[in-house]
């Protein structure tokens, strides 16, 4: 239904608090370097304007699109060119090209200092002084560092933050209460950020059809009792919502997401038996709960998939008549039977099925040709199962830090041209898959592992795209989204790489390492490990173990020394010499 004033419509639907939060997120994701105070001024101006449009939809400029209104606000910022360079060129364009231009300038790796969580006392003081400003800062800090973060979900995390601070700031030991709770929120939010980035990459590179296929598989796994038509409706809605958020239409995205939650709660009987608990919650929590819902029980009487898709004599006719519907039905039927598979795997199987029909339906005896298709799925299923088995075994043997190091060595050998910070970030994230997934029941491991790895590898691709340095990475990143993970897994040591020369300063450390938090210490060590592999890509596991063990002892010894600086200065060169010798 058309509205005279889109901005008035969204303000009324979302309410002032959520409206302001979403506008702040939008501005922070577009102009990532502006301070909070500058953005909040714009947010207040937009909010005041929206209120005038609510009062009178015919007021001046109220009929303008939200992109036009937001873009005009951003383009009016003084010194835009000084701070943002060529992004200012976007302002010479008309909508919708101007918004497209803004989107293209979003930076996945902005040059911002990592956000350091303040001490508990400081957080509580500032939160109690002004909760709105505190949470506004939270939205701003996260949104500018994650320009594709799913906006309505970020509002949910801000709400969680609010709950935690409200509860913990009255405790005597604020830090003991806050730290584990905020760590949990942060962990969930970081995973949400890479998952959403993957969705936007899918949308940007492969369009709505590819995303909708992903949504059909996911919904079918979650709601195996829903009819195909219901799954198609949900997938279409989810695709629209994600397209809006990825495209910067955050108000429409959040509004449509709330509408979808309402629809699902009104139609529980035809969707899933597991929704009721979610449907009793307020809007943000309801949507989040529905997005994380456990799988419904699979119907007991499902016939074999072969009946309709292999044994039926009309397979080629059905396929030819409506290819997308027939393939969608196949994906739905296969996915609802396999909550134990990753979405990536299900899409690979659907692709294999499609390729088989394309080939076989053009031949003389199609049924004989496609009759073995389900058996041909076996190697595609075994490959990720083996990946999960070997990696979880390695994780159980080495623990998270050791497993990260093993992954770091592996990926540095595959793509030694990639910058060390990017390799360390990717390996640390890939290495977390163990903690996240390997402790789950068997049936949940594969979807957890593969879909998480795919999202992390998408982040690697996005960063690599900015400054491409490795042909192998480019090749894996250019192909289909669902083939990425197998492509990276299949990479071996890059034989074309000319080893980096040994630079003593790369392995020179100072006493400042002693006071670093554990995480930062690990990153320092992992940086050294990646540099070692770049120097000696064919170093054996034992050689690397020896050098890294020696390095750990050296740091430990010097950090315990009375004169730390002197210890690092004298023992450091000895360590470098020993390392060179061990790797010779």
């Amino acid at each position: 239904e058309a509205h005279k004033s889109e901005i008035a419509h969204r303000f009324k639907d979302l309410g002032e608090q959520h409206f302001k939060g979403l506008v702040l997120i939008a501005f922070s994701q577009y102009l990532q370097k502006c301070p909070y105070e500058e953005h909040i001024k714009l947010v207040q101006e937009v909010t005041d304007f929206a209120k005038t449009c609510v009062a009178d939809e015919n007021a001046e400029n109220c009929d303008k699109s939200i992109h036009t209104l937001f873009g005009d606000k951003l383009c009016a910022i003084p010194k835009l060119r000084d701070n943002y360079g060529e992004l200012a060129d976007c302002c010479a364009k008309q909508e919708p090209e101007r918004n497209e231009c803004f989107l293209q300038h979003k930076d996945d790796n902005p040059n911002l200092p990592p956000f350091q969580r303040p001490e508990a006392e400081a957080m509580c003081t500032s939160f109690q002084e002004n909760p709105t400003s505190f949470l506004g800062h939270y939205l701003h800090e996260v949104a500018r560092r994650h320009p594709y973060f799913y906006a309505p979900e970020l509002l949910y995390y801000a709400e969680k933050y609010n709950e935690v601070l409200t509860q913990c700031c009255t405790e005597s030991d604020k830090a003991a209460c806050l730290t584990p709770k905020l760590d949990a929120v942060k962990e969930k939010a970081l995973v949400a950020a890479v998952r959403q980035r993957m969705k936007c990459s899918s949308m940007q590179r492969f369009g709505e059809r590819a995303f909708k296929a992903w949504a059909v598989a996911r919904m079918s796994q979650r709601f195996p009792n829903a009819e195909f038509a219901e799954i198609t409706k949900l997938a279409t809605d989810v695709t629209k919502i994600n397209k809006e958020c990825c495209h910067g239409d955050l108000l429409e995205c959040a509004d449509d997401r709330a509408e979808l939650a309402k629809y699902m709660c009104e139609n529980q009987a035809t969707i899933s038996s597991k929704l009721q608990a979610c449907c009793d919650k307020p809007v943000l929590q309801k949507s989040q709960c529905l997005a994380e819902i456990e799988h419904d029980n699979i119907p007991a009487d499902l016939p074999s998939i072969a009946a309709d898709f292999v044994e039926d004599k009309e397979v080629c006719k059905n396929y030819a008549e409506a290819k997308d519907v027939f393939l969608g039905t196949f994906l739905y039927e296969y996915s609802r039977r396999h909550p134990d598979y990753s979405v990536s795997l299900l899409l690979r199987l659907a692709k294999k099925y499609e390729a088989t029909l394309e080939k076989c339906c053009a031949e003389g005896d199609p049924p004989a040709c496609y009759g073995t298709v389900l058996a041909e799925f076996q190697p595609l299923v075994e490959e990720p199962k083996n990946l999960v088995k070997t990696n979880c075994e390695l994780y159980e043997k080495l623990g998270e830090y050791g497993f990260q190091n093993a992954v770091l060595v592996r990926y540095t050998q595959k793509a030694p041209q990639v910058s060390t910070p990017t390799l360390v970030e990717a390996a640390r994230n890939l290495g977390r898959v163990g903690t996240k997934c390997c402790t789950l029941p068997e049936a949940q491991r594969l979807p957890c592992v593969e879909d998480y790895l795919s999202a992390i590898l998408n982040r690697l691709c996005v960063l690599h795209e900015k400054t491409p340095v490795s042909e192998k990475v480019t090749k894996c990143c250019s192909g289909s989204l669902v083939e990425r993970r197998p492509c990276f897994s299949a990479l071996t040591v890059d034989e074309t790489y000319v080893p980096k020369e040994f630079k003593a300063e790369t392995f020179t450390f100072h006493s400042d390492i002693c006071t670093l938090p554990d995480k930062e210490k690990q990153i320092k060590k992992q940086t050294a490990l990646a540099e070692l592999v770049k120097h000696k890509p064919k170093a054996t596991e034992d050689q690397l173990k020896t050098v890294m063990g020696d390095f750990a002892q050296f740091v430990d010894k010097c950090c315990k020394a009375a004169d730390k600086d002197n210890c690092f200065a004298t023992e450091g060169p000895n360590l470098v010499a020993r390392s060179k010798e061990a790797l010779a």
Epitope: E121, T125, E129
Partner: nanobody, 118 residues
Framework: EVQLLESGGGLVQPGGSLRLSCAAS????????MSWVRQAPGKGLEWVST????????YYADSVKGRFTISRDNSKNTLYLQMNSLRAEDTAVYYC???????????WGQGTLVTVSS
């Protein structure tokens, strides 16, 4: 690493004004309560003023109340102290400090010298 860099000190006549600045870096500035502390020649440290994270609450020592104004600009990560009607007894090195808890400070600047003399 955390750095606090004061500036704006100098020689001023009694009754004159000065504005001190403190540029903060190496930490997220906005959630922290910040203070000014001074040390007159040969004397101990004296707390001057404190401001809450978003600037809605300010506190002053009786000796400067009505003459000094503390403020902050979180967008610039900067703390200020506007000093008016200066007196000879305001002569001191002025330090800005990051408050960690209940008027205890975990980081200080190097200080800026203010001399009030005719």
């Amino acid at each position: 690493e955390v750095q606090l860099l004061e500036s704006g000190g100098g020689l001023v006549q009694p009754g004159g004004s000065l504005r001190l600045s403190c540029a903060a870096s190496g930490f997220t500035f906005w959630p922290y309560t910040m203070s000014w502390v001074r040390q007159a020649p040969g004397k101990g440290l004296e707390w001057v003023s404190t401001i809450s994270p978003f600037g809605s609450t300010t506190y002053y020592a009786d000796s400067v109340k009505g003459r000094f104004t503390i403020s902050r600009d979180n967008s610039k990560n900067t703390l200020y102290l506007q000093m008016n009607s200066l007196r000879a007894e305001d002569t001191a090195v002025y330090y800005c400090a990051k408050v960690v808890k209940d008027n205890t400070f975990d980081y200080w600047g190097q200080g800026t010298l203010v001399t009030v003399s005719s």
